[in-house]
């Protein structure tokens, strides 16, 4: 299977909400032996391998933000996380999974990674990740709402979090 990032760059004004999204697709075994572990974390550019470093998002680790379920089941993190840290990760039945960040600040700027681990019994795993950049801007140059730049072309799209 593969992971696709719908957008490679999100440019948002301070105070806005944004939902970063990944989609995993391809031949997915929906059998009882397979479990999917999905998570989000921050990383940094300039590494040999993108997303190899795992840093917390707003002090929440990859384990705090992970989703864990079989097949394409829907799942989401606890609402406590969303309330306390302005974060919530979620997954739907179609392979989409996302993290919503509320009330963005300049400190939220950086590289974000989504990761899917396909886990089979006994403990064998296959990892695939996607990366995207979030730029939070302030002042007169900031957009009025979030602008997302698609991964495959230069056309931009205005987006707002649900």
């Amino acid at each position: 299977f593969k992971v696709a990032t719908l957008y490679s760059l999100y440019v948002c004004p301070e105070g806005q909400n944004v939902t970063l999204t990944c989609r995993f697709f391809g031949p997915v075994d929906k059998g009882h032996d397979v479990t999917f572990y999905k998570t989000w974390y921050r990383s940094s550019r300039g590494e040999v391998q993108t997303c190899s470093e795992r840093r917390p998002i707003r002090n929440l680790t990859f384990q705090d933000l992970h989703l864990h379920h079989g097949g394409h089941q829907a799942a989401n993190t606890s609402h406590d996380l969303a309330q306390r840290h302005g974060l919530e990760s979620a997954s739907d039945h179609h392979g989409n999974f996302s993290i919503t960040m509320r009330n963005l600040t300049l400190l939220d700027s950086g590289l974000y990674c989504c990761l899917v681990v396909e886990i089979r019994h006994h403990h064998s795993e296959h990892r695939v990740h996607g990366a995207m950049e979030l730029q939070v801007q302030t002042g007169k140059d900031a957009p009025s709402s979030c602008v997302a730049y698609p991964s495959s072309s230069q056309e931009s799209e205005n987006i707002t979090a649900a």
Epitope: H32, T35, Q49, S52, H66, H121, R127
Partner: antibody
Framework: DVQLQESGPDLVKPSQSLSLTCTVT?????????WHWIRQFPGNKLEWMGD???????NYNPSLKSRISITRDTSKNQFFLQLNSVTTEDTATYYC?????????????WGAGTTVTVSS | DIVLTQSPASLAVSLGQRATISCKAS??????????MNWYQQKPGQPPKLLIY???NLESGIPARFSGSGSGRDFTLNIHPVEEEDAATYYC?????????FGGGTKLEIK
């Protein structure tokens, strides 16, 4: 909160079978990863015995493979250990545990343990 | 099987000082940049309790005075500053290869 509780006989005679039950509350054994049996010998050495996956498939420590069986009853949310042809060397505290994943596999929830003595 | 050798077998540390426990694996426990090494604390009459997973990740609810480090074959658990309640036996455990194995344990006494 996930809780695990072991139950079974305290005393088993040599050459007989040891049978233990792990009752899981607060989490479905068909919804998680793997459910394990681990034992701790009187000298405190810990040994992983085997596990049963959410799908029902099993994996055993090769050192026990000819004697061990792990099964489950999903309707009761229980899984079981059967160890055949026991000897005094099988005297130990037996724990059931759940594993979890986070770029390593680890035991995040354990039962309190039950001590089994093998003696005639 | 992967053999985990812990050292020392026991140590006594003064309150507030640093306790350092080593775990050496007979072969690497790394995969894809991660170390499949975990640390547990066990007190008499209780089951082991997870402290650190993946060599350095602190389990939720565990005090920050516990930290883990290392990769490949060599791993360390540090406790600083040591508190009275830390008196226990500590075990490392690998999950890179079946059968999963544990170290022989290190008993920590507080002076």
């Amino acid at each position: 909160d996930v809780q695990l509780q072991e139950s079974g006989p305290d005393l088993v005679k040599p050459s007989q079978s040891l049978s233990l039950t792990c009752t899981v509350t607060g989490y479905s054994i068909t919804g998680g990863y793997n459910w394990h049996w681990i034992r701790q010998f009187p000298g405190n050495k810990l040994e992983w015995m085997g596990d049963i996956h959410k799908s029902g498939s099993t994996n055993y420590n090769p050192s026990l493979k000819s004697r061990i069986s792990i099964t489950r009853d999903t309707s009761k949310n229980q899984f079981f250990l059967q160890l055949n042809s026991v000897t005094t060397e099988d005297t130990a505290t037996y724990y059931c545990a759940r594993d979890y994943y986070g770029f390593s596999w680890y035991f995040d929830v354990w039962g309190a343990g039950t001590t089994v003595t093998v003696s005639s | 099987d992967i053999v985990l050798t812990q050292s020392p077998a026991s140590l006594a540390v003064s309150l507030g000082q640093r306790a350092t426990i080593s775990c050496k694996a007979s072969q690497s426990v790394d995969y894809d940049g991660d170390s499949y090494m975990n640390w547990y604390q066990q007190k008499p009459g209780q089951p082991p309790k997870l402290l650190i997973y993946g060599a350095s990740n602190l389990e939720s609810g565990i005090p920050a005075r516990f930290s883990g480090s290392g990769s490949g074959r060599d791993f360390t658990l540090n406790i600083h500053p040591v508190e009275e309640e830390d008196a226990a036996t500590y075990y490392c455990q690998q999950s890179i290869e079946d059968p999963w194995t544990f170290g022989g344990g290190t008993k920590l006494e507080i002076k």
